[in-house]
Interface confidence: medium
């Protein structure tokens, strides 16, 4: 879904799936005046590395094609546009 409405304190999963056999996957958030900011990235299965703003988030990469962003306890300051990307 392009739009998600969640309650404060809820655990939120954002799923990203790619079928291009890409190794690198990324989660960004985009906020007015701040541009794209990298949250986490992954360069392989089970590999997860912090981006510029990892606080309040975690990720999972159990399969090459799937990279999940997790908000452990959603807060109002996590209201944003979230974007996933992948690359070779």
């Amino acid at each position: 879904s392009r739009y998600l409405v969640k309650r404060t304190g809820e655990k939120v999963f954002l799923e990203c799936v790619q079928d291009m056999d890409h190794e690198n996957m990324f989660w960004y958030r985009q906020d007015p005046g701040l541009g794209l900011r990298l949250i986490y990235f992954s360069y392989d299965v089970k590999m997860k590395e912090k981006g510029d703003i990892p606080e309040g988030y975690s990720v999972s990469r159990e399969k090459k094609e799937r990279f999940s962003l997790i908000l452990e306890s959603a807060s109002t300051n996590q209201t944003s546009m979230y974007l996933c990307a992948s690359s070779l």
Epitope: N24, Y43, D44, K50, D52, P54, E55
Partner: antibody, heavy 121, light 105 residues
Framework: QIQLQQSGPEVVKPGASVQISCKAS????????MNWVKQRPGKGLEWIGR????????DYSGKFKGRATLTADKSSSTAYMRLSSLTSEDSAVYFC??????????????WGQGTTLSVSS | QIVLTQSPAIMSASLGEEIALTCSAN?????IHWYQQKSGTSPKLLIY???NLASGVPSRFSGSGSGTFYSLTISSVEAEDAADYFC????????FGGGTKLEIK
């Protein structure tokens, strides 16, 4: 320029604990993982674990989990490794090494000069 | 756990000779990094992600490979290349090869 300055050599008795420090300069300490690596003569290099000073997040090698404790002090840009229940097998040179990224893959791009630990009764 | 095996453990080379050091993995890895360690010093990044030269590394060094087999080549050995060379991978958690000691005849 980026530098990692480690504390001096240590001689400790079996069963004791030791703490080694690694002071970083020349980059934003809180934004890069700091790793610790063990080297015994003729035994190659062995990863112990890493800490992200920004939030204190840690990862450990299974072999060192429970015996190594990694901490970081952002105010002094210093990372610490504490090793407990020492045995002669822990006699080695210990390096701190920063994780840099190339093509989004982590590598150890800067290393401390090493700290020699001798465990002997 | 990914185990990296380097061969040979010790290599002796003449000045100007071309040599290759190898690193094999017990399971497929995406990348290999190489480090050079001269006696009494800390390791120095030499080649990252299989084939890219780190800053300041002479062009006589090159790296190649994929899957489970990787190599480091020195096209024309110089006296200053005498050192230990370690391969390194980071899949799930980091491991290193046992190293190759390069001696100059």
């Amino acid at each position: 320029q980026i530098q990692l300055q480690q504390s001096g050599p240590e001689v400790v008795k079996p069963g004791a604990s030791v703490q080694i420090s690694c002071k970083a300069s020349g980059y934003t300490f809180s934004g890069s993982w700091m790793n610790w690596v063990k080297q015994r003569p003729g035994k190659g290099l062995e990863w112990i674990g890493r800490i992200y000073p920004g939030d204190g997040d840690t990862d450990y090698s299974g072999k060192f989990k429970g015996r190594a404790t990694l901490t970081a002090d952002k105010s002094s840009s210093t990372a610490y490794m504490r090793l407990s229940s020492l045995t002669s097998e822990d006699s080695a040179v210990y390096f701190c090494a920063r994780s840099g990224y190339f093509n989004y893959v982590p590598v150890f791009d800067y290393w401390g000069q090493g700290t020699t630990l001798s465990v002997s009764s | 756990q990914i185990v990296l095996t380097q061969s040979p453990a010790i290599m002796s080379a003449s000045l100007g000779e071309e040599i290759a050091l190898t690193c094999s993995a017990n399971s497929t890895v995406g990348y290999i990094h190489w480090y050079q360690q001269k006696s009494g010093t800390s390791p120095k990044l030499l080649i990252y992600t299989t084939s890219n030269l780190a800053s300041g590394v002479p062009s006589r060094f090159s790296g190649s490979g994929s899957g489970t087999f990787y190599s480091l080549t020195i096209s024309s050995v110089e006296a200053e290349d005498a050192a230990d060379y370690f391969c390194h991978q980071w899949s799930f958690y980091p491991t290193f090869g046992g190293g190759t000691k390069l001696e100059i005849k």
